[in-house]
């Protein structure tokens, strides 16, 4: 779970140890603040649960790519 000590900076201290299927995902945000101990990705699920993940892991990168592709509005 992400932890906001001094809002609005949210940090992750532990990463999920299980791969989250893309069907469960709604969005993500990157955590890059120097106030946090490590870079992280926070996935938000379709039932509004927030899950910290390691951006170095391939499944995390693949999931972000997948969300990015499907979120893009096609140009007409």
């Amino acid at each position: 779970q992400p932890d906001a000590i001094n809002a609005p900076v949210t940090c992750c201290y532990n990463f999920t140890n299980r791969k989250i299927s893309v069907q469960r995902l709604a969005s993500y945000r990157r955590i890059t603040s120097s106030k946090c101990p490590k870079e992280a990705v926070i996935f938000k699920t379709i039932v509004a649960k927030e899950i910290c993940a390691d951006p170095k892991q391939k499944w995390v990168q693949d999931s972000m790519d997948h969300l990015d592709k499907q979120t893009q509005t096609p140009k007409t």
């Epitope: 893309v22 469960r24 709604a26 969005s27 938000k44 379709i46």
Partner: antibody, heavy 119, light 112 residues
């Protein structure tokens, strides 16, 4: 072919409990959240809650806390919902469903069971 | 809970004519992640509900492109460009931004 097959109609006594099932085929329930929705005769839809079949996590709408209990068995790819302390207010069709905004390839999906009538 | 108010509740339409259903929420459905979790369902007589539209305007697979969704914040619209006989049923808006998820009371579309 993706399908959610719910158990048959139930006729129950006031004060008793009933457990209805929702068997999935064509996909793995552990990759999804399973939801339950109530529809009283001639009425609208009410969301009951969801279960994460992978770890058993649940979340219930406040109205259904203590009334509904959701479980899942990943080995049989089946979700269950037990309703307790039944009254006439619980007479309804209950639907299981699963949905996503971002599927595995081309956008979202949503699947619904055929509904279980509890009288 | 977020209240979803649909209008009209009954919508008689002539075949081939357009139809429009409004859905208003008691609070903004714009989430902190910048997305708006507003969906539309169709329930034909005697059938289970079926999702038509998600994230305000995205059409589910297999849904005819005569259906479209639009809106933002608290005001949303489902449009059918040319109503066909198979469109008869009840249409619900459904929000997933705020807990608990809630549905509109439904709009019954019938053929005049």
């Amino acid at each position: 072919q993706v399908q959610l097959l719910e158990s048959g109609a139930e006729l129950v006594r006031p004060g008793s409990s009933v457990k209805i099932s929702c068997k999935a085929s064509g996909f793995n329930i552990k990759d999804n959240y399973m939801h339950w929705v109530k529809q009283r005769p001639g009425q609208g839809l009410e969301w009951i809650g969801w279960i994460d079949p992978e770890n058993g996590d649940t979340e219930y709408a406040p109205k259904f806390q203590g009334k509904a209990t959701m479980t899942a068995d990943t080995s049989s790819n089946t979700a269950y919902m037990q309703l307790s302390g039944l009254t006439s207010e619980d007479s309804a069709v209950y639907y299981c469903n699963t949905w996503a905004y971002y599927g595995t390839s081309y956008g979202g999906f949503a699947y619904w069971g055929q509904g279980t009538t509890v009288t | 809970d977020i209240v979803m108010t649909q209008s009209p509740l009954s919508l008689p339409v002539t075949l081939g004519q357009p139809a429009s259903i409004s859905c208003k929420s008691s609070q903004s459905l714009l989430d902190s992640d910048g997305k708006t979790y507003l969906n539309w369902l169709q329930q034909r007589p005697g059938q289970s509900p079926k999702r038509l539209i998600y994230l305000v305007s995205k059409l589910d697979s297999g849904v005819p492109d005569r259906f479209s969704g639009s809106g933002s914040g608290t005001d949303f619209t489902l449009k059918i460009s040319r109503v066909e006989a198979e469109d008869v049923g009840v249409y619900y808006c459904w929000q997933g931004t705020h807990f608990p998820q809630t549905f509109g009371q439904g709009t019954k579309l019938e053929i005049k």
